[in-house]
Every structure is written in C-alpha cells, then in structure tokens.
C-alpha cells in the first residue's frame, strides 16, 4: 500500500523555538516515521532538517538549526515505513516574519502603595530578536485579586512602577511584549500576584516640581510632616528603557542630600542636556519613606519654559486676558513649539483668597468680578504632556481695577 504524504503542516516559532506540527494522512498505518528536509533561498539542493528525522510523533523541534532568521526557507515532509510517501512541500516562510514573541519573565517587588515590575525577555540573548532587543516595549493587565476589575497599561519598559495602590492588598498582573517596529505583539506571561505591604509610617513626598531661577534649578515638593530630612536622586531616562539594565543607578544630587526643607536649589550645570527622572525620599532619622513617584525632567523644555506674558482688558464684571509668547532678553518672543496649558491665578488685591483657571486657549475670560475693584493676576505655563510635568515659574502679578457697572459689553 502506498504511503500518503502528511498534510496540514504548521510552523510555530516562539522566540528561538521552532516547532513543526502536522497531521498523519493515514491513521490506520502503524509504525510510520516522518522526516523533513529544508531548502534555503537560491539553493537547489535539499538538506536534512536536524531534529526532524525519523520522528514517530507528529511534532518536532528544529531549534538547534542555526538559521538566518531573515532568510526565506522552504520545508518538505514525507512519511516513511518500508517505503516512503511522496514529499509534501510546505509554503516557504521567513522565520522572523513568522515568529511570535514569547512570554516575558516578570519579577515583582511590593511597597505599601506601589508595585515595582521588572520585565525581561523570556529568551535570554535571543537570536530572533538580537537586532530588536532594545525595541521591546511591554503592556500589562493588572487587577485586584478580590475584584477582578482589569486595568490595562500600555507602552512600558523593562522596569515599571505602578502607584496609588492600596496597602495590604493582593494584586495580580500579566505582561506581554511587543515589537512595534515589526508589528509584533507577544504572548502574555503567566499571572503573577503579590500583596502590597503594611502602610509605611512615613508617606513619600508628593507634587514634585522643577523650575528655573537664574542659573539654578529649584526642586520643590510637598510633605505631610515637619522636621524631616530629604534626599533627591536622578536617573537618565534612557537607562530605564535598556533591557540589559538590572540595576538602576540612581545618582544623588550633591545639593539635595539630607536637606531639611521641602525644596533644594542646585546649579543648572549639574545636568547635561537630556531627559532625566527625579525622585525624592523623606526620613525622620529612624524611618524612611518609600521613594516618591518619579517625575520626568527635560532640561531642554525646563530651561526654555518661561512664564507667559499677558495683557488684561478690564470690564466691569470680568477681565479678558490675552496670553502672548514670553520674552527673552532683548525683548524678542520665545517660540515654544510644544503645546502648553495656562494656569491663571487671580485674587482681590485686599484679600488672600486665590482663584484658579486652567485654559488651553490664549484668550481667557476671568468672570464674576466686582466692579471698581482691584484684582491681581499671575500666570504660568505647563506642558500638556503629563509625564513631562514641566511648569514655568509664575509671571509677575499684574493688578488692574475693574470698570464701573454696566460696561460688560
């Protein structure tokens, strides 16, 4: 009886694992083995596929074959007993194009209200992704074990910290990798769960802001308690993206070590041009807080994010404020080619009660003012990218008197 060729051959490639699966054509014939050959592009001869010769099952692994993953190859299979079937040719394919990204390795560390996630590729020193290792980004799904309500977080790197969690609570998550340059989305990791710790006695510092004054950076933050000391650390933002980096080398800022106030001032030349991450930690001598949320700090934006310049047109019950580009020395306007949002603070000259308006537009109406009353206005600009969190210093306050009643037109 003639042996039939095997059919329905599937090639599964995950990272550097090459797996072949196929269907027997004739289940009734026993003791059949299967063998594969492969052929590289531009070659006439077929070569025996090592790892896939005389296979008794319907699956084989040819991961040991050192292929150029960007080069097209062709496979063929036949069944063998006393005689052999005809060859069945599999559609040619390029390993890299066919490959899927395997599940990443995930390691979790718990804080009281945060989880640190360390992610690394599932296959170390992968041949498949050798040229793309630095391009991996990850996404994750996280949920409270008790509720199951999922939150997705996209576009993270090999170390990510999730904040604003609840103490003593179990969270579960799974992570998958992506190579956006090749339109590849990977397979999710197994689910990992971890319980956040008991709430720390000292909370981390909050609301970190950087501004420029003269030739210095001024770093400010908020803190709940008095009589504390603080330290500030920085990290090159790009180091976070590096998958080979297991130790993030946060560095100290000399003028921000053991400061007793909720701000520190240091020379601009401490940082070269670039994007940095900053974090602050509090200590009372016995206990130490966890680190604050990290803020992104771009020296280019920070240096040139100047306070806005504005004109006020006074009416009886409102101000019309027209915001213009800030002026640099020499009175020439600064071109700021990134979107800004404006924070306008105003108050009655005789009172300390401030009111705030946030606007994207450069013409703003301040409503509900009293006639013939002096109001003061100051403004500052913020970048609209939440992560960059850049703010200019406030402009000098400008005070104007509203017009008498019935001049609102």
């Amino acid at each position: 009886k003639n042996l039939k060729s095997p059919q329905k051959v599937e090639v599964d490639i995950i990272d550097d694992n090459f797996i072949l699966r196929w269907n027997r054509s004739d289940e009734s014939v026993g003791n059949v083995t299967f063998s594969f050959d492969y052929q590289k592009t531009g070659m006439d001869n077929w070569i025996k596929l090592s790892g896939c010769q005389n296979i008794t099952s319907t699956k084989c692994n040819f991961s040991s074959l050192k292929l150029n993953v960007y080069e097209e190859i062709k496979l063929r299979i036949r069944a063998e007993k006393e005689n052999t079937s005809s060859w069945y040719e599999v559609d040619s394919f390029t390993p890299f194009r066919k490959a899927q990204i395997g599940p990443p390795e995930v390691h979790l560390e718990a804080e009281d209200k945060a989880i640190v996630i360390h992610i690394s590729p599932g296959t170390k020193d992968s041949v498949m992704w050798a040229l793309d290792g630095l391009s991996f980004t990850y996404s994750l799904v996280i949920w409270k074990n008790s509720s199951g309500v999922e939150e997705r977080i996209e576009n993270i790197y090999s170390r990510h910290k999730i904040y604003k969690l609840s103490p003593e609570t179990t969270y579960c998550l799974k992570v998958k990798a992506a190579l956006l340059t090749s339109w590849k989305i990977g397979v999710y990791s197994p689910v990992h769960c971890i319980k956040t710790t008991v709430e720390n006695e000292l909370p981390p510092p909050e609301n970190i802001e950087v501004s420029v004054q003269n030739q210095n950076y001024v770093l400010k933050w908020d803190y709940t308690y008095a009589n504390m000391t603080f330290q500030v650390q920085w990290l090159h933002a790009f180091l976070k993206r590096n998958p080979g980096n297991h130790l993030y080398k946060w560095k100290q800022i000399p003028d921000c070590e053991n400061v007793k106030t909720t701000q520190c001032v240091f020379p601009q030349n401490v940082f070269q041009k670039g994007i940095y991450l900053l974090r602050v930690q509090a200590s009372d001598g016995n206990n130490t807080s966890f680190w604050s949320e990290e803020i992104k700090f771009d020296t280019e934006i920070q240096a040139f994010l100047l306070p806005p310049v504005f004109n006020i047109r006074s009416l009886s019950d409102s101000f019309h404020i027209y915001i213009g580009a800030p002026k640099q020395s020499g009175n020439t306007p600064v071109i700021q080619d990134y979107p800004l949002i404006y924070e306008i603070i105003f108050w009655e000259n005789t009172s300390n009660a401030e009111r705030k308006i946030i606007e994207k537009k450069t013409d703003v109406t301040v409503p509900n003012l009293k006639p013939l009353t002096v109001y003061c206005v100051k403004a500052r600009a913020h970048t609209m990218d939440e992560k960059l969190n850049k703010s200019s210093v406030f402009s000098d306050a400008v005070c104007e008197k509203t017009k008498p009643g019935n001049t609102s037109k």
Partner: antibody, heavy 118, light 106 residues
C-alpha cells in the same frame, strides 16, 4: 580620604575558588556601587561585576556562572568569589567605587595579583 | 553586551602635541561613559565622567566629548606625565571597557 584596601589568596590551583575582600576606610559605604575589575598580564581591563550596599548585584554575562559578589555592611566590606579558576583567570584584581553623583569609578583599591598555576 | 572600540590601539606623540583618542560604542549609550588613565604597575585613574565632565584634580588639558556612539578624549598639550594607557568605559548596562590606547613618546 576614602581608601579601598584589598586582600586575598594570591596563588591558586586550577579548579579552586578565588576569594578576595575589599574594605572601605574613611568614607560612607551606603549609596555607592562597588565593582570588581581584573586585568590579565599585559592586557586590558575586564569588568567582573558590581553590587550596591543593599546587596543587589549585576555580573558580566561571560563570568556570571562562576561569580559571587557579596557585601558585609557591618564591616564596610565587599567580597568576590570566582569558582573553578583556570590559568585564564590569572590577573590583577581591583575593587573600585562608583561615584554616587555620576557615572565613573572614582576610587580604586591597590590591586591584588592572583596567579593560577598547577 | 555593548562593545567599545578604541582607536588607535597605540600612538606615538611628542610633548606639546595635541592628541585625540576615540571610543566607539556598538550601540547608543547616551553620555554614560568615562575615561581612565593607567600607568604601568599603577591603578587606573578617573579622568572624565559622564562623557565630558572633568574629574576633580585632573588637569584642564584633558577634555572629553561625544554622546550616543562616538566619543573622544583630547589632550590639548601633551606633558611628560601623560604617557600612559587610556581606557574608555560605559555604564549603559553591563559595564564594559574599551581595549585601551597606549600613548608612547615619539
């Protein structure tokens, strides 16, 4: 003035374990990364691995399977162990401190010559 | 691991010469690069950190520049005590050193 003082066995037989210690005198231990570097005779510098004061480590992938670096914060000491040595491990071994303010190894130990011979 | 390739491997120069040594990284390392000087039988000495910052106590004739993959160490006017071997080193992930550049008297 911070000083790093190194010591350990200088003569080893193949397959033995190299063991070196580096003590930090006159300066703070925490907040720094501590590296071990070696230099075979007449050759360049090769980084072995590093550790921070909390014990987190990072190793040269080519040596990772044989290297253990540890810290004893109570003594301000860093230790290096390299198992299954061969003649290729013959070198001057240095410990060095990475600045806590910038990326550079700013303080070095005096170096320990280790020879592996049968 | 990131490879650092220094060029030249050795060079001869005279006192007073301006000398430039280059260091090329196999992938971008931003500015996390340092330069060291080592004299025979001595420990390496840090000259430049963060690619272009001069270490305290190092003469100003030494300077560093570059970012990304290409870096240079320049000695503006060679002094007799500058004849030594120079190494670059990156801190991007696993630390690696360049193979060294031997600077000898012409």
């Amino acid at each position: 003035q911070v000083q790093l003082q190194q010591w350990g066995a200088g003569l080893l037989k193949p397959s033995e374990t190299l063991s070196l210690t580096c003590a930090v005198y006159g300066g703070s231990f925490s907040g720094y990364f501590w590296s071990w570097i070696r230099q075979p005779p007449g050759k360049g510098l090769e980084w072995i691995g590093e550790i921070d004061h909390s014990g987190k480590t990072n190793y040269n992938p080519s040596l990772k399977s044989r290297v253990t670096i540890s810290v004893d914060t109570s003594k301000n000491q860093v230790s290096l162990k390299l198992s299954s040595v061969t003649a290729a491990d013959t070198a001057v071994y240095y410990c060095a401190r990475e600045s806590k303010y910038y990326f550079g190894l700013d303080v070095w130990g005096q170096g320990t010559t280790v020879t592996v011979t049968s | 691991a990131i490879q650092l390739t220094q060029s030249p491997s050795s060079l001869s120069a005279s006192v007073g010469d301006r000398v430039t040594i280059t260091c090329r990284a196999s992938q971008g390392i931003y500015s996390v690069l340092a330069w060291y000087q080592q004299k025979p039988g001595k420990t390496p000495k840090l000259l430049i950190y963060d690619a272009s910052r001069l270490e305290s106590g190092v003469p100003s004739r030494f300077s560093g520049s570059g970012s990304g993959t290409d870096f240079t160490l320049t000695i503006s006017s060679l002094q007799p005590e500058d004849f030594a071997t120079y190494y670059c080193q990156q801190f991007n992930s696993y630390i690696t050193f360049g193979q060294g550049t031997r600077l000898e008297i012409k």
